[in-house]
Amino acid sequence: EPPTACREKQYLINSQCCSLCQPGQKLVSDCTEFTETECLPCGESEFLDTWNRETRCHQHKYCDPNLGLRVQQKGTSETDTICTCEEGLHCTSESCESCVPHRSCLPGFGVKQIATGVSDTICEPCPVGFFSNVSSAFEKCRPWTSCETKDLVVQQAGTNKTDVVCGPQDRQR
């Protein structure tokens, strides 16, 4: 009696179970009474990453430099190429099909996490006692100057965008 289900790494065709092709190979002929499934290796710049019955291999992803992309990991017959972004850029999606410049943190905000090829800059507001007076993709919030340690006094209070202004102590009593 013909099978209705097949083992792992097999598929059902013409009432018989045929072996799937291994990763890196495509199907060129289903098994017959006289022969096993026939598979051929994927060509240059092609891949298949699973046990399969595909008659065509997939093309490796192209990391288009015009979109700011570069190759992070070269594809093999069993894996796709992995793209990442050039310095100063990050991917717009998980599949990394295009890149955009890293966001800068505006004055009053500092860099919590520096951007990578695949993630944007993460900014955070400068808390009390810290400030950032620049728009930057790298600078963290800096602490206000400690006037006391310089034997100075605060002449102008700091904000999240400005440092304190220190001055000499008023010696007049």
């Epitope: 097999q10 072996s19 060129v28 002929s29 098994c31 017959t32 009474e33 006289f34 022969t35 096993e36 499934t37 026939e38 051929l40 008659t55 065509r56």
Partner: antibody, heavy 114, light 112 residues
Framework: QVQLQESGPGLVKPSETLSLTCTVS????????VHWIRQPPGKGLEWIGV???????NYNPSLKSRVTISKDNSKNQVFLKLSSVTAADTAVYYC????????WGQGTLVTVSS | DVVMTQSPLSLPVTLGQPASISCRSS???????????LQWYLQRPGQSPGLLIY???NRFSGVPDRFSGSGSGTDFTLKISRVEAEDVGVYYC?????????FGQGTKLEIK
Amino acid sequence: QVQLQESGPGLVKPSETLSLTCTVSGFSLPTSGVHWIRQPPGKGLEWIGVIWAGGDTNYNPSLKSRVTISKDNSKNQVFLKLSSVTAADTAVYYCLGHGHFDVWGQGTLVTVSS
Amino acid sequence: DVVMTQSPLSLPVTLGQPASISCRSSQSLVHSSGNTYLQWYLQRPGQSPGLLIYKVSNRFSGVPDRFSGSGSGTDFTLKISRVEAEDVGVYYCSQTTHVPWTFGQGTKLEIK
């Protein structure tokens, strides 16, 4: 029913290219492969190669540098070319449908001689 | 390439007597699927080869039950229980497990 018919010139000069045609009926070239096998007079059988349904090919490594198999699905024909032939290529050439190993063509004798 | 070695190369047999042909492969013919793709063909004088046995022991449709195939791995046998006149010709074993497909050198069966 499945049928295969080999045809081509019976005589080829040394160093020239042998060209044969296999015309098939009873099965579909876009869904089935075709093999070429040869048999020198009084000797055994040798697998030459195959063209698969999608047009991919496998060749016997011993002949790979000289052999080309192609096909024309619309004409139900498969072609064998063997270049730079010598007397050692004198043989009966058979075509065979993949999965139809019970049905061989009648074969065509090709003699390599000047 | 897988080398297929047949013995004997010549086999004179009396009509009605049994006959046996051996075929050895230089490497295992067991595919990773568990199947073994070993065929036997008979080429009668002046004819194309005809399929007798496939996958070691399966008789092709229309083949008389006096023909049987057995074996595993690298050792295979074709047996004819009682030879008849129409069995004369050259017998070939063939493997389609590994590319390139290969054939034995043939065993010529003749009537004594």
